[in-house]
Amino acid sequence: PEPPTACREKQYLINSQCCSLCQPGQKLVSDCTEFTETECLPCGESEFLDTWNRETHCHQHKYCDPNLGLRVQQKGTSETDTICTCEEGWHCTSEACESCVLHRSCSPGFGVKQIATGVSDTICEPCPVGFFSNVSSAFEKCHPWTSCETKDLVVQQAGTNKTDVVCGPQDRLRA
């Protein structure tokens, strides 16, 4: 028979034949042959693989480093990674929760709607038209654009949500 060029789901192609992938929680020890099945072995303690795979090494569980304010939210299994979270009152810097901050900052273009408390993180809001924020801050609100008119000046450059307007002198009409 013709050697296969593609295999079924949960199989992989090697040496012109289809072998079964190892199930989640197990790693590949040896590929299948004409006469033998794929050989897989369970991941060790503190290791995991979360997909059907042909990996020869399991991944290490994530370490929730207490020096970074991290603690274990959910212990890893042979099929799942450990999930970290931050100590009470602290907040993850990303979805992956690799480090902790006391509160998040609002990026340029956003202002602080509510300053963080012991129980809630900073609440940011986009700067509306007529307001801007050019800094990353955990306490500053959006600031209103400068009013050129009150300074007897004209707008030379329009403001954005991240920049103030630029004012300049009015053009004098020549006689």
Epitope: N67, L68, G69, C86, E87, W90, T93, S99, C100, V101, L102, H103, R104, S105, V135, S136, S137, A138, F139, E140
Partner: nanobody, 116 residues
């Protein structure tokens, strides 16, 4: 490596004053928003005050408004907190922090005890 060293704490009577300092190194101090936070015995961290990089804008918790003043000297890489009209409830360890206020980026703190 970011280092923040707080000093100036001590024992003071109610109504008294103290000036806390925070010496910063390992980062460009003038580029960062800075915070003072405090932790009273058996309590969580409380945000006390903040100041923008230029020292032109400030924030104060309601509990310290009108009594505490935050300032900074960018030429000396130092943050200050002038505390007046101190009360028993101001007793806490005071910490300074740079924004973003990371868990691994804050100092040992300085203890302020307000008692008669």
């Amino acid at each position: 490596e970011v280092q923040l060293l707080e000093s100036g704490g001590g024992l003071v009577q109610p109504g008294g004053s103290l000036r806390l300092s925070c010496a910063a190194s390992g980062f460009t101090f003038r580029d960062y928003e800075m915070w003072w936070v405090r932790q009273a015995p058996g309590k969580g961290l409380e945000r006390v005050s903040a100041i923008n990089p230029q020292g032109t804008r400030t924030y104060y918790a309601d509990s310290v408004k009108g009594r505490f003043t935050i300032s900074r000297d960018n030429s000396k890489n130092t943050l200050y907190l002038q505390m007046n009209s101190l009360r028993a409830e101001d007793t806490a360890v005071y910490y300074c922090g740079k924004e973003p206020f990371r868990y691994d980026y804050w100092g040992q703190g300085t203890l302020v005890t307000v008692s008669s």
